[in-house]
């Protein structure tokens, strides 16, 4: 799997999980989240060469198409596969509220 | 939806469905498929600017992050959303066989 265990341990130019820390205030302009101040969002990036972690039949076909037609621009792309939620604390007035924001953290990637 | 109805009608630099015809023999080296000789596989390509058809909370966050940090390399990517199967005819010796190959045709795209 193209997850932290694999990607953060290996220097990989191909599609892999990349570390990305997002500071809510500085990077998103969000002042409403009290805790945490930021989080490890991560992101997916890198080349999708021939059949590198291809996700669907179509992406495998596209990968094969690209190998045989190297001048083609139709190549698979490195995107998130598994996502996890993030629990945040914010205030409505003076009242604290805990909320779970879905699909905020990328855990693994794929070529799609 | 970033489908044929929208994308094939508009000239769009942003993430959209692009037409791609694949000839099985010429483009994939597949001699075993008898019919069809090829098919409209399509593919997804184009930029994913701020909130352009963002798929998940993470891709929306990443989109916003990129707007505030334009030098960042962490941007969403244009990938397939809805896929459809393709029915093929091939031969086992002289005996014809019909098979449905799943996820062979891209019908729409998203920024993920």
């Amino acid at each position: 799997a193209l997850d932290a265990a694999y990607c953060f341990r290996n220097v990989q130019d191909n599609c892999c999980l990349r570390p990305l820390y997002i500071d809510f205030k500085r990077d998103l302009g969000w002042k409403w989240i009290h805790e945490p101040k930021g989080y490890n969002a991560n992101f997916c990036a890198g080349a999708c060469p021939y059949l590198w972690s291809s996700d669907t039949q179509h992406s495998r076909v596209l990968s094969l198409y690209n190998t045989i037609n190297p001048e083609a621009s139709a190549s698979p792309c490195c995107v998130s596969q598994d996502l996890e939620p993030l629990t945040i604390l914010y205030y409505i007035g003076k009242t604290p509220k805990i909320e779970q924001l879905s699909n905020m953290i990328v855990k693994s990637c794929k070529c799609s | 939806a970033l489908d044929a109805a929208y994308c094939f009608r508009n000239v769009q630099d942003n993430c959209c469905l692009r037409p791609l015809y694949i000839d099985f023999k010429r483009d994939l080296g597949w001699k075993w498929i008898h019919e069809p000789k090829g098919y409209n596989a399509n593919f997804c390509a184009g930029a994913c600017p701020y909130l352009w058809s963002s798929d998940t909370q993470h891709s929306r966050v990443l989109s916003l992050y990129n707007t505030i940090n334009p030098e960042a390399s962490a941007s969403p990517c244009c990938v397939s959303q809805d896929l459809e199967p393709l029915t093929i005819l091939y031969y086992i010796g002289k005996t014809p066989k019909i098979e449905q190959l799943s996820n062979m045709i891209v019908k729409s795209c998203k920024c993920s």
Epitope: Q57, L64 | G29, K31, W32, Y91, I92, G93, T95, L101
Partner: antibody, heavy 120, light 108 residues
Framework: QVLLVQSGADVRKPGASVKIFCKAS????????MHWVRQTPAQGFEWMGS????????TYARRFQGRLVLTADTSTNTAYMELRSLKSADTAVYYC?????????????WGQGSLVTVSS | EIQMTQSPSSLSASPGDRVTITCRAS???????LAWYQQKPGKVPKLLIY???SRAPGVPSRFSGSGSGTDFTLTISSLEPEDAATYYC?????????FGQGTKLEIK
């Protein structure tokens, strides 16, 4: 040049399973159908089945149906043959072979063979 | 399943001889679903002829194939010492693919 490199010789007990790999190089693995054939002095050549990479369509000889699994890993250009519930009659040299293109076809390149001995 | 019967099962011939091996199918294969292979002791089979009469790349022109329906032949027009081997026919008109029992060719 086209090369099909198979795993080495193996000894198995009756009732066990064996899995042989066939690593392809020198051509576009996903464009060709891969076959498995075995050879014994008594039976000669016996075709076992074929697998089409990417789409994972496997065709099996009826006599092996139910205990043979053919797969192809396109990420490593490797085909696999797993034969279960082994009997002494399964002692043979097992070959992977690439076809000229059709599901059933002539086989233009063969692996070096993997000897499997089934003995208690 | 289609049975493939080769004849003769063995033969001995001299360099320069013309040699013919026949293969009979238990049912019609049509005109192009037959292949011929050469196998030397301890070696892997080598494709000689496919589609009943098409020579595989790199195969010397002294090897030729003919036939259709149920009767097929492999001909070596002028035997060379390196042609000593066992020759097999194979049908791929129907599943399962089946092979002949082999013809062992010895050079005198």
């Amino acid at each position: 040049q086209v090369l099909l490199v198979q795993s080495g010789a193996d000894v198995r007990k009756p009732g066990a399973s064996v899995k042989i790999f066939c690593k392809a190089s020198g051509y576009t693995f996903s464009s060709n159908v891969m076959h498995w054939v075995r050879q014994t002095p008594a039976q000669g050549f016996e075709w076992m089945g074929s697998v089409i990479p990417i789409v994972d369509i496997a065709t099996y000889a009826r006599r092996f149906q139910g205990r043979l699994v053919l797969t192809a890993d396109t990420s490593t250009n490797t085909a696999y043959m797993e034969l279960r519930s082994l009997k002494s009659a399964d002692t043979a040299v097992y070959y992977c072979a690439r076809t000229l293109g059709l599901v059933l076809d002539a086989m233009d390149y063969w692996g070096q063979g993997s000897l499997v001995t089934v003995s208690s | 399943e289609i049975q493939m019967t080769q004849s003769p099962s063995s033969l001995s011939a001299s360099p320069g001889d013309r040699v013919t091996i026949t293969c009979r199918a238990s049912q019609s294969l049509g005109s192009s679903y037959l292949a011929w292979y050469q196998q030397k002791p301890g070696k892997v089979p080598k494709l000689l002829i496919y589609g009943a009469s098409s020579r595989a790349p790199g195969v010397p022109s002294r090897f030729s194939g003919s036939g259709s329906g149920t009767d097929f032949t492999l001909t070596i027009s002028s035997l060379e010492p390196e042609d000593a081997a066992t020759y097999y026919c194979q049908q791929y008109a129907d599943s399962p693919i089946t092979f002949g029992q082999g013809t062992k060719l010895e050079i005198k």
